[in-house]
Amino acid sequence: GVSFFFLSFHISNLQFNSSLEDPSTDYYQELQRDISEMFLQIYKQGGFLGLSNIKFRPGSVVVQLTLAFREGTINVHDVETQFNQYKTEAASRYNLTISDVSVSDVPFPFSAQS
């Protein structure tokens, strides 16, 4: 089976603009690429299947997405702990200043869209 987690965080050193609503824009693609690479680094251990339903909102930039793991390989607490532990490296490697991290269980990935 698969476990899904809804993750929300702020990138306080970036500014939202309307191009972050469109996946064909440079800004969207660059930020999505950095975030995707970052999560591959954070959850290197077996069990991480990927991320989906990425959405950007105003508030500097608020990022909302769904993470997928093989069932039983990680829990909500560990998802949040590992992400928080990576904040310093995210700043140095990707120039992303991360704050206000929130993680919750979701029954299926599309919940992130509501």
């Epitope: 939202f16 309307s18 469109d22 996946p23 509501s114």
Partner: antibody
Framework: EVQLVQSGAEVVKPGASVKMSCKTS????????INWVRQRPGQGLEWIGY????????EYNEKFKGRVTLTSDTSASTAYMELSSLRSEDTAVYYC??????????WGQGTLVTVSS | DIQLTQSPSSLSASVGDRVTITCRAS??????LNWLQQKPGKAIKRLIY???SLDSGVPSRFSGSRSGSDYTLTISSLQPEDFATYYC?????????FGGGTKVEIK
């Protein structure tokens, strides 16, 4: 089915203001952007600005800055555009267009504003 | 501001004809271009997004492509319901801008 329903036609006097609405329905996202565009009689399309529904985040075309105010009400899924200091050349159909995974995905039917003394 | 030069401004064609409309961008806009259809008294409809992606429910006779700074909307076999005005729209940078429009009329 996604729908954008705009408020009805307005006739206003030069120098006055007009406020129109754009109500959206039929989509699962509760947060998204609304762009506003106008079309003067017999002319092409002109971008006015953008608001992210439920936030105070806005972008404006410099041409309209100072005369246009974009606001929204998340609970009513409605965006508003107010245009002030109206002149005859503001006579136009004003459209809202909402994002749906990408920009300008769905369009309203338009609100005709006639500026006349 | 980025200028979009759309041509032709109008054209006459018959049902079944292949129709091509072009937009030239004054600056690099990547793939950030949409094609819109406007019919009198109806809401504007997006046909193509991101240069070449067909919107849901849009017939496959519509297609979009790019060659350098030239962007093309093609209608492979014009149908009666396709007589309308078409606009290109760039959203690479603000202010977002539109082409001048192409009115497709019945020959």
């Amino acid at each position: 089915e996604v729908q954008l329903v705009q408020s009805g036609a307005e006739v206003v006097k030069p120098g006055a203001s007009v406020k129109m609405s754009c109500k959206t329905s039929g989509y699962t996202f509760t947060s998204y952007g609304i762009n506003w565009v106008r079309q003067r009689p017999g002319q092409g399309l002109e971008w006015i600005g953008y608001i992210y529904l439920g936030s105070d985040y806005t972008e404006y075309n410099e041409k309209f800055k100072g005369r246009v105010t974009l606001t929204s009400d998340t609970s009513a899924s409605t965006a508003y555009m107010e245009l002030s200091s109206l002149r005859s050349e503001d006579t136009a159909v004003y459209y809202c267009a909402r994002s749906a995974g990408s920009l300008f995905g769905y369009w309203g039917q338009g609100t005709l504003v006639t500026v006349s003394s | 501001d980025i200028q979009l030069t759309q041509s032709p401004s109008s054209l006459s064609a018959s049902v079944g004809d292949r129709v091509t409309i072009t937009c030239r961008a004054s600056q690099d806009i990547g793939i950030t271009l949409n094609w819109l259809q406007q019919k009198p008294g109806k809401a504007i409809k997006r046909l193509i997004y991101a240069t070449s992606s067909l919107d849901s429910g849009v017939p496959s006779r519509f297609s979009g492509s790019r060659s350098g700074s030239d962007y093309t909307l093609t209608i492979s076999s014009l149908q009666p319901e396709d007589f309308a005005t078409y606009y290109c729209l760039q959203y690479a940078s603000s202010p977002y801008t539109f082409g001048g429009g192409t009115k497709v009329e019945i020959k």
